[in-house]
Interface confidence: low
């Protein structure tokens, strides 16, 4: 059956889009490149502005296969740098601590609850 508007805000479809398109530098065609570029920038802004990471949290980038994981090995970037706590210059407060998962240096809240929360309350 056709997907409804609400379906696109369910965690699974939201997660699927993020995993497939975020930082996907090897798309099959130009149309996909446009979408991937848009998805990447949207997620970057979302994670930076809302101080969140992934759909459910940083573990999304560890548990699932993703374009991001294909492009970045786990030791260097367990999750995108946008998941790190930033200073006023939008640079990671402590990149190494963020990569190591030291509490206070990365955002452990998923973005889905921040986006869906206000919608679900109406």
């Amino acid at each position: 059956t056709a997907a409804t508007q609400q379906d696109f805000f369910t965690p699974n479809l939201f997660l699927k889009q993020m995993l497939e398109r975020y930082q996907n530098n090897s798309p099959p065609n130009n149309d996909d490149q446009w979408k991937n570029n848009g998805v990447t920038k949207t997620w970057d802004r979302l994670m930076l502005q809302d101080n969140c990471c992934g759909v459910n949290g940083p573990s999304d980038w560890q548990k699932y296969t993703s374009a991001f994981r294909t492009e970045n090995n786990d030791a260097d970037y367990p999750w995108p740098r946008q998941c790190c706590v930033m200073n006023n210059l939008k640079e990671p407060l402590n990149l190494e601590a963020c990569k190591l998962g030291v509490p206070g240096f990365y955002h452990n809240q998923g973005c889905y609850e921040l986006i869906s929360g206000p919608m679900n309350r109406h």
Epitope: N25, N30, D31, Q33, W34, G38, N72, N73, D76, Y77
Partner: antibody
Framework: QVLLQQSGPQLVRPGASVKISCKAS????????IHWVKQRPGQGLEWIGM????????SFNQKFKDKATLTVDKSSSTAYMQLSSPTSEDSAVYYC???????????WGQGATLTVSS | DIVMTQSPSSLAMSVGQKVTMNCKSS????????????LAWYQQKPGQSPKLLVY???TRESGVPDRFIGSGSGTDFTLTITSVQAEDLADYFC?????????FGAGTKLELK
Amino acid sequence: QVLLQQSGPQLVRPGASVKISCKASGYSFTSYWIHWVKQRPGQGLEWIGMIDPSDSETSFNQKFKDKATLTVDKSSSTAYMQLSSPTSEDSAVYYCARSYYASRFDYWGQGATLTVSS
Amino acid sequence: DIVMTQSPSSLAMSVGQKVTMNCKSSQSLLNSNNQKNYLAWYQQKPGQSPKLLVYFASTRESGVPDRFIGSGSGTDFTLTITSVQAEDLADYFCLQHYGTPLTFGAGTKLELK
């Protein structure tokens, strides 16, 4: 096919602002960064900066930060570079080129010759 | 800034000879995330715009003759033309796109004897 068509040669007086255009066709304009490169005879190639047509985000070589202004018109799939207060040092061939994210330049414009002379 | 040092600045070769030119970067161009070297080689014929030959240091661009071979990793890179042809008369230069500002080698001018 992919084509980056640049504006023709220009002769300008020192101090008079100049704008060079780069019209893209044959691909999704907002999917690739547009770069600008300067080439002076016997002086090699210099990267000026780049612009992301999807949101007009720019990144510059600090050397050209106060010299070049990069803009795009998405409706016509055209990128522009404006050079302020040109001097004879700005006389060169200027190329536009495209890249996908931080990848190589796979297509280049034919070059636009700028001559600054009184 | 990453400095790209290209050598030699010029060389004269006869048709059929093997040509080797080098590019050395002031820092590594190897992205440890994907094990790719962010270096490309271009050919520029007189009066023309540059043409992509090789990217990621060793991947030949589609349509480029297989006599053009890119090699190297880290800071040292080589472009080899296994059997030079008359139409290969041109300037060749490398580009690093590992970090901004993007920087080019000064170029190698290939002339025919």
